[in-house]
């Protein structure tokens, strides 16, 4: 087999908290040369085996490279809910993509506060 991507399809996290976005690539033959992370169509970060990690400037205060070839997304807001894509560029063997749906939920503190207010 050329290669496979394994990831959790759906994950959730609390507003204000953090989440790890992780894709696992396995192959007997293909060698990873670069990994791109996207939020919908917007590039979050690039990992190049040669050049290292580069986080898009718009996310640089909230996205931390790692662990491994994943990303840690911090200070989550409700607007961060949506699809995230990892793209593994390999040689030889081409391109492998994984998809994660992140649901950012209202923090438990907010939910408790709202319940008390009602």
């Amino acid at each position: 087999t050329a290669g496979t991507i394994d990831t959790k399809r759906n994950i959730s996290a609390e507003e204000g908290g953090s989440v790890i976005l992780q894709c696992h690539f396995s192959s007997d033959t293909a060698e990873v040369t670069q990994v791109d992370w996207k939020q919908q169509d917007q590039l979050l970060a690039i990992y190049s085996v040669d050049l290292g990690w580069h986080v898009a400037s718009v996310f640089s205060d909230r996205v931390v490279p790692g662990p491994s070839l994943g990303l840690t997304f911090q200070s989550l807001t409700m607007n961060d809910t949506g699809e995230y894509f990892c793209t593994y560029h390999t040689y030889p063997g081409g391109i492998y993509k994984g998809r994660i749906f992140l649901k950012v939920q209202e923090s438990s503190d907010d939910r408790n506060g709202l319940a008390q207010f009602q």
């Epitope: 040369t33 670069q34 996207k38 040669d50 050049l51 400037s57 560029h89 391109i95």
Partner: antibody, heavy 122, light 107 residues
Framework: QVQLVQSGAEVKKPGASVKVSCKAS????????MGWVRQAPGQGLEWMGI????????SYARKFQGRVTMTRDTSTSTVYMELSSLRSEDTAVYYC???????????????WGQGTTVTVSS | DIQMTQSPSSLSASVGDRVTITCRAS??????LNWYQQKPGKAPKLLIY???SLQSGVPSRFSGSGSGTDFTLTISSLQPEDFATYYC?????????FGGGTKVEIK
């Protein structure tokens, strides 16, 4: 002003090596990636590789891996491109070019050297 | 490696014409697409980066559009100094490959 000045033309025999220099001035040398691009006579542009002058990390086009070495000297703000085992098809103008954005993924090359002509002939 | 295909390879146009050059990537490159202008015997010059952002000092008659795999460079009103060869380049995945070039000649 921001400037890249390359070394002069070279004539080499097949099998030899050539080392082209590119001296940067007018900006913080370590903050911008430097790429190398070549152009054979009457042909298009060919990307050879790139170097991070601060840490020395490099990425080479697979076509040139094993034959090309890109290095830098931070004390003189100079990057070097050495190409070995030269053949006639390496005859070209070699350009160094600075990446547009500092400390970021190289999004485009905004400042170019004047080019260095390398002729490989027996 | 990502292949970049430009079309046409050459075109003839007159001063004042609207000129469109296209560039297609063999896979999605998001908006990581640059356009360069090169005149004979000179180094290339960056015109457009990130598919549609105009490089400082470049006349506003140059514009870029597209994302994913299909991109366009438009010169809204061709000037005498615009006769040159134009190259696209992707900068998402190393090696940062160039298109084959489009030569814009005087009709």
């Amino acid at each position: 002003q921001v400037q890249l000045v390359q070394s002069g033309a070279e004539v080499k025999k097949p099998g030899a090596s050539v080392k082209v220099s590119c001296k940067a001035s007018g900006y913080t040398f370590g903050s911008y990636y430097m790429g190398w691009v070549r152009q054979a006579p009457g042909q298009g542009l060919e990307w050879m590789g790139i170097i991070d002058p601060s840490g020395g990390r490099t990425s080479y086009a697979r076509k040139f891996q094993g034959r090309v070495t890109m290095t830098r000297d931070t004390s003189t703000s100079t990057v070097y491109m050495e190409l070995s085992s030269l053949r006639s098809e390496d005859t070209a103008v070699y350009y160094c070019a600075r990446a547009r954005t500092p400390s970021s993924w190289p999004y485009g090359m905004d400042v170019w050297g004047q080019g260095t002509t390398v002729t490989v002939s027996s | 490696d990502i292949q970049m295909t430009q079309s046409p390879s050459s075109l003839s146009a007159s001063v004042g014409d609207r000129v469109t050059i296209t560039c297609r990537a063999s896979q999605s490159i998001n908006s990581y697409l640059n356009w360069y202008q090169q005149k004979p015997g000179k180094a290339p010059k960056l015109l457009i980066y990130a598919a549609s952002s105009l490089q400082s000092g470049v006349p506003s008659r140059f514009s870029g559009s597209g994302s994913g795999t299909d991109f366009t460079l438009t010169i809204s009103s061709l000037q005498p100094e615009d006769f040159a060869t134009y190259y696209c380049q992707q900068s998402l995945l190393t090696p940062f490959t160039f298109g084959g070039g489009t030569k814009v000649e005087i009709k």
